[in-house]
């Protein structure tokens, strides 16, 4: 199709080197078309505009995505062309971040249904550069925390080193849906609960003489409770004997519960006794079987091809540890009677 | 500051445009919004015009007003007046930290709407 | 829709004495604390006087204030004087912009 109808829109994405972080593109569709599409402005799909020029279907994800290669060859599907890039909906997912991301991006409606859907297309030239060392020290990570139940802000990564006075007006959205009261580099949150969690774009307008652009952040909030204040309990075992039988093969599981640390480095680990000597065992990788706002149960387990008599002499013991301190837990092993 | 014009006696259904016009501030960094207020009644929140082009409207108002800009005005349509259409309606600059507190407002203008 | 519903509708205070008005939202406003206060004399538009609840606009005395409980809002003016007669209306900003609207405002008379 002939995209030179399509309205057009520059992106500056300016990514760190430092972090890994995400970036999408809406499908911003002319109005009144992007309300029919995507509800972005927040019509219900029963409060569609009067008279649309474009009267295309009320599925959200009935837009097609196309890249335009920069040697003029035809438009390439993103879906099929790109797997880094993840369409959900009417937005398009950038997972990884790098120069060769630039280019022009261009969505349109799936159904054409009149003669003036042929316009009703977007073309979006997103340029992608790394930061340039320390312009700002102490920028925002593209990766932010909220305290849960205290007071809280959400910084425009690539304004937090301006100050309120000077920052330029923003446009926030969370999850896609525009935030139509921000207009700061910074969203203070009062109160924080569970549904500030998301992901958060912040979009400003840079100009020079010659022509103006978006400049535009993504940020993953999470919402986190206050670090844990204990060390971490083993759950399992709970005794501190295991009747086994000989020659048979044996598996030991130890759960244990990490409460919440916002740099979390669970150990758990399982280490032999036998006598003064005492070894730590290669045993398969803890795995996450539960995690909460709150905590985490991490699972590991250790593995006897077949319990010897050797075995019965030793104590297998499980060891957790957090910032705040370790615990353990020994299992003696007994031979079954009868 | 900011001042609203094109207020007038309309006949019901006649569509009336309103304007108002922006100095000092540019309409790409702020949200502008329309309240009317009928005489010897309350405020009515109309809509709001953000700066990157959203529009959203009160449920009320919905199909009644379209809301749309330049680069240095902002214009209210009223599609199909009504005599309850008749009111005083102003437009109101949002703040430097938020797009919905109202520090500047014009004097409004009165749109009369009868037979 | 949401229902902000302002009390009371008229109220009457002496010089010198303090005037509460309320304004319960039906909903919680945008981020718990999107809440405004406006006062408008007559002939002349509404004027800002607490945003966000409970900050107050620039150039507003003191004698305002803004606080919160739950989804109820309270506007106290401490030390009324003569000036201060006029109606006071909030507004409440909602997730939905749809739902954003007015209270239906509160006359103070000042004695």
């Known amino acids: 199709f002939n995209i030179s109808g399509c309205s057009t829109k520059k992106l500056l994405w300016t990514y760190s080197t430092r972090s890994e972080e995400e970036f999408v593109l809406f499908c911003d569709l002319p109005e009144p078309q992007k309300s029919h599409f995507c509800h972005r402005n927040r019509l219900s799909p029963k409060q569609v505009p009067e008279h649309l020029p474009f009267m295309g279907s009320n599925d959200l994800s009935d837009v097609q995505w196309y890249q335009q290669p920069s040697n003029g060859d035809p438009l390439e599907d993103i879906r099929k062309s790109y797997p880094h890039i993840i369409q959900d909906k009417c937005t398009l997912h950038f997972l990884t971040p790098g120069v060769n991301n630039s280019g022009s991006y261009i969505c349109r409606p799936k159904m054409i249904k009149s003669p003036y859907d042929v316009a009703c297309c977007v073309k979006m030239i997103l340029e992608v550069k790394p930061q340039t060392n320390a312009s700002c020290e102490y920028s925002a990570s593209h990766k932010q925390d909220l305290l849960l139940g205290s007071t809280g802000s959400i910084s425009c990564p690539s304004l937090s080193c301006q100050s309120d006075a000077q920052s330029p007006a923003v446009t926030w959205y969370k999850n896609g849906k525009l935030l139509s009261v921000e207009r700061s580099n910074r969203i203070v949150v009062d109160e924080v609960y569970d549904y500030h969690q998301g992901t958060y774009v912040c979009d400003y307008t840079q100009s020079d003489t010659v022509s103006s652009w978006t400049v535009r952040a993504v940020v993953q909030v999470r919402t986190i409770v206050g670090d844990t204040k204990l060390k971490p309990d083993i759950l399992d075992p709970v005794e501190d004997t295991l009747e086994v039988e000989l020659g048979k093969p044996l598996t030991i599981s130890c759960k244990a519960r990490f409460g919440f640390e916002r740099v979390f480095n669970p150990v758990i680990k399982w280490y032999i006794k036998d006598s003064d000597l005492e070894w730590e065992v290669s045993v398969p990788e803890a795995k996450s079987i539960k995690s909460t706002l709150k905590d985490e149960i991490i699972e590991r387990n250790i593995i006897l091809e077949k319990v010897t008599q050797r075995d019965l002499r030793r104590k297998f013991v499980c060891f957790v540890q957090n910032s705040i301190g370790n615990t353990t837990q020994s299992v003696q092993l007994k031979e079954k009677r009868g | 500051s900011v001042e609203e014009s094109g207020g007038r006696l309309v006949t019901p259904g006649t569509p009336l445009t309103l304007t108002c016009t922006a100095s000092?501030?540019?309409?790409?960094?702020?949200?502008m919004s329309w309240v009317r207020q009928a005489p010897g009644k309350g405020l009515e929140w109309i809509g709001i015009i953000h700066y990157s082009g959203y529009t959203a409207y009160a449920s009320w108002a919905k199909g009644r007003f379209t809301i749309s800009k330049t680069s240095t005005t902002v214009d209210l349509k009223i599609t199909s007046p009504t005599t309850e259409d008749t009111a005083t309606y102003f437009c109101?600059?949002?703040?430097?930290?938020?797009?919905?507190?109202?520090?500047?407002w014009g004097p409004g203008t009165l749109v009369t709407v009868s037979l | 829709a949401q229902v902000l519903t302002q009390t009371p509708s008229s109220v009457s205070a002496a010089v010198g004495g303090t005037v509460t008005i309320n304004c319960q939202s039906s909903?919680?406003?945008?981020?718990?604390?999107?809440l405004a206060w406006y006062q408008q004399k007559p002939g002349q538009p509404p004027n800002l006087l607490i945003y966000r609840a409970s900050k107050l606009a620039s150039g507003v005395p003191s004698r305002f204030s803004g606080s919160r409980s739950g989804t109820q809002f309270t506007l106290t003016i401490s030390g009324v004087q003569c000036d201060d007669a006029a109606t006071y209306y909030c507004?409440?900003?909602?997730?939905?912009?749809?739902?954003?609207?007015f209270g239906g405002g509160t006359e103070v008379v000042v004695k």
């Open positions: 000092g501030f540019s309409l790409s960094s702020y949200a």
């Open positions: 109101a600059r949002g703040g430097d930290a938020d797009n919905f507190y109202y520090n500047i």
């Open positions: 507004l409440g900003v909602y997730d939905d912009d749809a739902d954003n609207a």
């Open positions: 909903q919680s406003v945008y981020s718990n604390n999107h």
